[in-house]
Interface confidence: medium
């Protein structure tokens, strides 16, 4: 038995990456630990070295292949183990039966760009990265806009309940600097969660025309 409470959480990016975080109260210090992935029907297995991210948690990425290759599907069950070196042997610290498409977290959207900007509105587009063809159109997005004098946490969330890789932001203030972020989530999967937020896209609305009301 492992001393202290242990938490082992992993997500699949839907293509060729499983990211894992292992947290352990009273974990062993100065010990080499790794995550080992054994798919039950594939002809490969994979290991990654757990690196500390805080006092009692470690993380690593299992790189399963080329970024856009479909390495796992809904049929797969992957046995994931945390193994820590104990003298000359490896000790199993945590184990889980991992169903990739029940534990999805996609990569953050990329290639954000301003398609068209006016005084009060801005049209922005983006692309999804390394998302499985299996989702077809079964994705949703959340977006947020950072206004001057506010924080990201205060920004209201805009929800797009379909695979729509653009948005038209309305009721903006002329000649004002804004930042925009978007994240994506598949509709599938009991434990699926939102992707990280995209890199912020900075843009500025056009100034109002002279002599006109704003």
């Amino acid at each position: 038995a492992v001393n202290g409470t242990s938490q082992f959480t992993c997500f699949y990016n839907s293509r060729a990456n499983i990211s894992c975080v292992w947290s352990q109260d009273g974990a062993l210090q100065d010990t080499s630990c790794q995550v080992h992935a054994w798919p039950d029907r594939r002809r490969w297995n994979q290991t990654c070295e757990l690196l500390p991210v805080s006092q009692a948690s470690w993380a690593c990425n299992l790189i399963l292949g080329a970024p856009d290759s479909q390495k796992l599907t809904t049929v797969d069950i992957v046995t994931l183990r945390v193994l820590c070196r104990e003298g000359v042997r490896w000790r199993v610290m945590a184990i889980q039966d991992f169903k990739p498409f029940e534990n999805l977290r996609l990569m953050a959207p990329i290639s954000l760009q301003v398609v068209h900007v006016e005084t009060h509105r801005c049209n922005i587009s983006w692309e999804i990265s390394q998302a499985s063809h299996y989702f077809e159109r079964h994705l949703e997005f959340e977006a947020r806009t950072l206004s001057p004098g506010h924080t990201w946490e205060e920004a209201p969330l805009l929800t797009l309940k379909q695979k729509q890789e653009w948005i038209c932001l309305e009721t903006l203030t002329p000649d004002t600097q804004y930042e925009f972020q978007v994240r994506v989530k598949p509709l599938q999967g009991e434990f699926t969660t939102w992707s990280p937020w995209s890199q912020p896209l900075a843009f500025r609305t056009k100034p109002a025309a002279l002599g006109k009301d704003t």
Epitope: D40, R41, T73, V75, I77, Q96, D97, H133, Y134
Partner: antibody, heavy 120, light 107 residues
Framework: QVQLQQSGPGLVKPSQTLSLTCAIS??????????WNWIRQSPSRGLEWLGR?????????DYAESVKSRITINPDTSKNQFSLQLNSVTPEDTAVYYC??????????WGQGTMVTVSS | DIQMTQSPPSLSASVGDRVTITCQAS??????LNWYHQKPGKAPELLIY???QLETGVPSRFSGSGSGTEFTFIISSLQPEDTGTYYC?????????YGGGTKVEIK
């Protein structure tokens, strides 16, 4: 060699529950390398996979969306068998039902099949 | 869900003939395709797994090929006992799905 022996009634009334059992010999239902499946076959639907149960570090189940709200597949380790329960049956559930072992991504061992008719 | 389209639905050939059946998947399934043979009143029997691997004990006149979305099953020299229905099955995504079958008869 591995064999699967099916048992259960051939006639079920509409709205009742269809129950079938698949007894395993020569393998273990709780083995770490196989999955245990139910498939049905009818003239209208052809071969249709219904679901599976399997043990890795715990028991797992996967079901076809078309029957997900009505189906249960349970292992019985003491008898080395697994069962199918399909609730609220209709005449559309009339079919030959098969149990099968999946080993290395293919159904290599099948039960003999049970013809189930849903009729009042 | 992945649709499997099998053709032809039926065929009639003479003993010794070369028989070809094709199976098309609605999306890429790598090489996770199996072929089964079913006699009337019997359960299907596995012939080929992983698109091209011959199951133990299956005669070498049966072969399979293909990857991605297009797959082919060949009986190099048809024998009387080969009558029945042949099915392809994808094993890359849940729900597992089957082709509609090809009924093979002897002329």
């Amino acid at each position: 060699q591995v064999q699967l022996q099916q048992s259960g009634p051939g006639l079920v009334k509409p709205s009742q529950t269809l129950s079938l059992t698949c007894a395993i010999s020569g393998d273990s239902v709780s083995g770490n390398s196989a999955t245990w499946n139910w498939i049905r076959q009818s003239p209208s639907r052809g071969l249709e996979w219904l679901g599976r149960t399997y043990y890795r570090s715990k028991w797992n189940h996967d079901y076809a969306e078309s029957v997900k709200s009505r189906i249960t597949i349970n292992p019985d380790t003491s008898k080395n068998q697994f069962s199918l329960q399909l609730n609220s049956v209709t005449p559309e559930d009339t079919a030959v039902y098969y149990c099968a072992r999946d080993s290395k991504s293919a159904f290599d061992i099948w039960g003999q099949g049970t013809m189930v008719t849903v009729s009042s | 869900d992945i649709q499997m389209t099998q053709s032809p639905p039926s065929l009639s050939a003479s003993v010794g003939d070369r028989v070809t059946i094709t199976c098309q998947a609605s999306q890429d399934i790598n090489n996770y395709l199996n072929w089964y043979h079913q006699k009337p009143g019997k359960a299907p029997e596995l012939l080929i797994y992983d698109a091209s691997q011959l199951e133990t004990g299956v005669p070498s006149r049966f072969s399979g090929s293909g990857s991605g979305t297009e797959f082919t099953f060949i009986i190099s020299s048809l024998q009387p006992e080969d009558t029945g229905t042949y099915y392809c099955q994808q094993y890359d995504w849940l729900p597992l799905s089957y082709g509609g079958g090809t009924k093979v008869e002897i002329k």
